[in-house]
């Protein structure tokens, strides 16, 4: 094949090599950029900055090598458009530092920075940590800071991410109230801070105020939906990012719903209860307090992390006619109480039939493992003339 006269030449099916001395000062308009998986750049003394726009359109890029060139600065968001990048070789350039943000969000298997005049500072604490933890092949490079010795020996006692304290109201918050949250940020070299409010949706009207080092957030006219929702304060410095999440408890009275009994492996009277604080529950059977036992008891489903409502069952193991009747669920918290009732009829009296004269009912064997916590049944022959589903 004839030698390639261009600044950059194809290499394999999806690679590009740019090695002609001084031919590039940016990476705009590389040929076939959208399909590139590998880009090799060498001897480009005029290529001094790598920024967001340089790698736009290189969404398939896996390997990027820029060596023996003039690279002085890599923007924190330079690789935003190359999320698949797994190997990054920036050796033998003029880099004094590289922000932690540059590699955040990437899954780098390899990061090569040897041969750069790195300047030891807290901004490279993340790289020192990579070296300590054996990440990205960094330890093998024995990185040095220009005139300062090994990166591994850099003092790091003062290199911490920001410290955040979020103040929430001590007093009870009611529906319709306005709530002021304050986030105090401490630390060296603070760069940015803010609130993450993605979970709030229609839970309140949001107004932000203030700036570093004290950020205010007013949640106006809060609803009960605000419960279990994270309000997050974040801050960044040259070392890294810190986040603290809080939740605001909005008090509201207990409520309860009951549904018709259903037969599963066992019988279940489904219920839903809501309220903040979480209500205490009590069952009545035909107007009298129901004492829970291993035959009749309250069973909760796994709660959703972001809501206060709890779903569950009054579970009845093999109920008989004595369990037929009126079931009432009482729910109460300091802000109110509620109740709901339902009639349940599980069966007629099964003990009045003559066992000498059974009604034959045939069931298929069940040999699978039991997931219900009930014994695994082999077969069910019911002499009481009451057909039952076998779970």
């Amino acid at each position: 094949a004839a030698p390639c006269p261009d600044a950059c030449c194809p290499h394999g099916s999806s690679g590009l090599r740019c090695t002609r001395d001084g031919a590039l000062d940016s990476l705009h308009h590389l040929p076939g950029a959208e399909n590139l998986t590998e880009l090799y750049i060498e001897n480009q003394q005029h290529l001094q900055h790598l920024e967001l726009r340089d790698l736009r359109g290189l969404g398939e890029l896996r390997n990027l090598t820029i060596v023996k060139s003039g690279l002085r600065f890599v923007a924190p968001d330079a690789f935003h458009f190359t999320p698949r990048l797994s190997r990054l070789n920036l050796s033998f350039n003029a880099l004094e530092s590289l922000s932690w943000k540059t590699v955040q969000g990437l899954s780098l298997q390899e990061l090569v920075l040897s041969g750069n005049p790195l300047h030891c500072s807290c901004a490279l604490r993340w790289l020192q940590r990579w070296e300590e933890e054996g990440l990205g092949g960094v330890p093998e490079q024995k990185l040095q800071c220009h005139g300062q010795g090994p990166l591994a020996h850099m003092p790091n006692a003062s290199c911490g991410v920001p410290t955040l304290k979020v103040q929430v109201p001590n007093a009870s918050v009611d529906v319709g109230d306005d709530v002021l949250l304050r986030c105090q940020v401490e630390g060296r070299g603070l760069e940015q801070a803010g609130w993450i409010l993605t979970e709030l949706e229609q839970s309140a009207t949001v107004m932000k105020s203030g700036g570093l080092p004290s950020l205010g957030l007013t949640l106006a006219n809060v609803t009960s939906d605000l419960n279990r929702k994270n309000v997050t304060c974040w801050a960044e410095n040259d070392v890294g990012r810190a986040e603290v999440s809080v939740q605001v408890n909005v008090s509201f009275p207990a409520s309860v719903q009951l549904h018709t009994a259903v037969e599963m492996h066992h019988w279940c009277i489904p219920f839903s209860v809501d309220g903040q604080p979480a209500p205490s529950l009590r069952w009545l059977f035909n107007g009298s307090v129901l004492n829970e036992t291993s035959f009749i008891f309250t069973e909760f489903l796994e709660p959703a992390a972001n809501e206060t409502v709890r779903h569950g069952c009054l579970r009845l193991n093999q109920p008989t006619h004595v369990n037929n009747g009126n079931y009432t669920l009482l729910a109460a918290n300091p802000f109110g109480q509620a109740s709901a009732s339902i009639m349940a009829a599980f069966m007629d009296n099964p003990f009045e039939f003559n066992p000498e004269d059974p009604i034959p009912v045939s069931f298929s064997p069940v040999d699978t493992n039991s997931t219900s916590g009930d014994p695994v049944e082999k077969k069910d022959e019911t002499p009481f003339g009451v057909s039952v589903a076998v779970g």
Partner: antibody
Framework: EVQLQESGPGLVKPSGTLSLTCAVS?????????WTWVRQPPGKGLEWIGE???????NYNPSLKSRVTISVDKSKNQFSLKLSSVTAADTAVYYC????????WGQGTLVTVSS | SSELTQDPAVSVALGQTVRITCQGA??????ASWYQQKPGQAPVLVIY???KRPSGIPDRFSGSSSGNTASLTITGAQAEDEADYYC???????????FGGGTKLTVL
């Protein structure tokens, strides 16, 4: 498969407290099951002692209620029995089991009350 | 009263059918469960609830109930069925459990 294993001292002095633990393996003590203690004096029948649910509900045999405490430790996946003011009549093999049907049992541990 | 009464001993010829009974007021309200216990071993559940049989229990074991009496029937008794059999149910109050005194089954 659920397995239960009782452990505790085999000899308790009269008027002392009998303490046993039942370790549950092959399943979570926080499942939708209750856990129970049953005892059997030598050469005699079975006697139900009491039961507990992981949320703290418990029920005891009325004849033993004043002396019995059953507790659960979810972090260790185990539950325990304490029987106070024991006498020779409390000498028995003590079993733990899964309620309500007692479909899984421990192998039992003999506790002798003697000075 | 919170009692379940069983015959202390019952015998059966090999291959024949035997019925072990359990009497008590609570059996008008609640199901009996049945346990087999061999010397030096923990009891084993054989019947529970509405004549339900756990996995691994032969179908020669069945349960029934009428009035205040629950019965465990072994149809075609085998030598390995020789054991003590205990019934259990909820007490009439429903708040605790009671066992019968046990029946020693001998297979001849």
């Amino acid at each position: 498969e659920v397995q239960l294993q009782e452990s505790g001292p085999g000899l308790v002095k009269p008027s002392g407290t009998l303490s046993l633990t039942c370790a549950v393996s092959g399943g979570s003590i926080s499942s939708s099951n209750w856990w129970t203690w049953v005892r059997q004096p030598p050469g005699k029948g079975l006697e139900w002692i009491g039961e507990i649910y992981h949320r703290g509900n418990r029920n005891y045999n009325p004849s033993l209620k004043s002396r019995v405490t059953i507790s659960v430790d979810k972090s260790k996946n185990q539950f325990s029995l304490k029987l106070s003011s024991v006498t020779a009549a409390d000498t028995a093999v003590y079993y733990c089991a899964r309620a309500p049907w007692f479909d899984y049992w421990g192998q039992g541990t003999l506790v002798t009350v003697s000075s | 009263s919170s009692e379940l009464t069983q015959d202390p001993a019952v015998s059966v010829a090999l291959g024949q059918t035997v019925r072990i009974t359990c009497q008590g007021a609570s059996l008008r309200s609640y199901y009996a469960s049945w346990y087999q216990q061999k010397p030096g071993q923990a009891p084993v559940l054989v019947i529970y609830g509405k004549n339900k049989r756990p996995s691994g229990i032969p179908d020669r074991f069945s349960g029934s109930s009428s009035g205040n009496t629950a019965s465990l029937t072994i149809t075609g008794a085998q030598a390995e069925d020789e054991a003590d059999y205990y019934c259990a149910s909820q007490a009439s109050s429903g708040n605790h459990l009671i066992f019968g005194g046990g029946t020693k089954l001998t297979v001849l």
